[in-house]
């Protein structure tokens, strides 16, 4: 069937970057400016995406591929192909309907995007809080209270440093 179709349909010979022009006896015409066709045999070219406002051009449109956008500084991409730009907040904040708001007590956000998340509950793992949480940082859990016998150090000494990729002697 494919072979038959290509014999009958001159449009199948039109390469990417062109379209099959019905107004000109199905001649393969180049895509007009600001349009593209990414596959062969197209009867029309698609309009190039325009990166406007907070969207900036990451890759220019060509006759065979669409433009690609990202976001200007202070914003980050959301959605497939950067279909949205969302304003950054500071660490320790989240974007709400009323703008960037500080994380509530007991929550943190260590990024400029996303939502505030609850601090880790160390006691669920039978551990104690070694370092308190902040708006920007999660708590650090330490050994369980039972491990902290009098005189015992509450912090495990670090392992001796070694070069990456080397096994311990």
């Amino acid at each position: 069937f494919e072979r038959t179709r290509s014999l009958q349909d001159p449009c199948s010979n039109c390469p990417a970057g062109t379209f099959c022009d019905n107004n000109r006896n199905q001649i393969c015409s180049p895509c007009p400016p600001n349009s593209f066709s990414s596959a062969g045999g197209q009867r029309t070219c698609d309009i190039c995406r325009q990166c406007k406002g907070v969207f900036r051009t990451r890759k220019e449109c060509s006759s065979t591929s669409n433009a690609e956008c990202d976001c200007t500084p202070g914003f980050h991409c959301l959605g497939a192909g950067c279909s949205m730009c969302e304003q950054d907040c500071k660490q320790g904040q989240e974007l709400t309907k009323k703008g960037c708001k500080d994380c509530c007590f007991g929550t943190f956000n260590d990024q400029k995007r996303g939502i505030c998340r609850p601090w880790t509950n160390c006691s669920l793992d039978g551990k104690s809080v070694l370092v308190n949480g902040t708006k920007e940082r999660d708590v650090v859990c330490g050994p369980s209270p039972a491990d902290l016998s009098p005189g015992a150090s509450s912090v495990t000494p670090p392992a001796p440093a070694r070069e990456p990729g080397h096994s311990p002697q």
Epitope: R49, K52, G53, V54, F55, C69, F75, L78, C82, S83, M84, C85, E86, Q87, L95, T96, K97, K98, G99, C100
Partner: nanobody, 122 residues
Framework: EVQLVESGGGLVQPGGSLRLSCAAS????????MSWARQAPGKGFEWVSG???????YYTESVKDRFTISRDNAKNTVYLQMNSLKPEDTAVYYC????????????????WGQGTLVTVSS
């Protein structure tokens, strides 16, 4: 064809006022949410304010109680009344459609005006 044309920018002294207008055409304005953004010289964009089709308004913290967004659906125009202007309000102000209805978020299908420059200086 969608068009957004801003006007009303200019030079104003600190503490002064300006009213920006954005005339819209080429789409159903009355059912569209609209927004204002700004870009200070050498800096990134900042979401300033937004207004839903029903009239609910939203502002970024730094302009709250100083700026007022409003709309006139009969004139297909959205306004930004700016009072108590500060030097840090100096920027190019852009009008844009606001299809996401989410604070600080614009989508690729939103339309943008060319901007109007507001300079706050003595």
């Amino acid at each position: 064809e969608v068009q957004l044309v801003e006007s009303g920018g200019g030079l104003v002294q600190p503490g002064g006022s300006l009213r920006l207008s954005c005339a819209a055409s080429g789409f159903t304005f009355s059912s569209s949410a609209m927004s204002w953004a700004r870009q200070a010289p050498g800096k990134g964009f900042e979401w300033v304010s937004g207004i839903y089709s029903g009239g609910s308004t939203y502002y970024t913290e730094s302009v709250k109680d100083r700026f007022t967004i409003s709309r006139d659906n009969a004139k297909n125009t959205v306004y930004l009344q700016m009072n108590s202007l500060k030097p840090e309000d100096t920027a190019v102000y852009y009008c844009a459609t606001w299809g996401t209805l989410r604070f600080g978020v614009w989508a690729e299908y939103d339309h943008w005006g060319q901007g109007t420059l507001v300079t706050v200086s003595s």
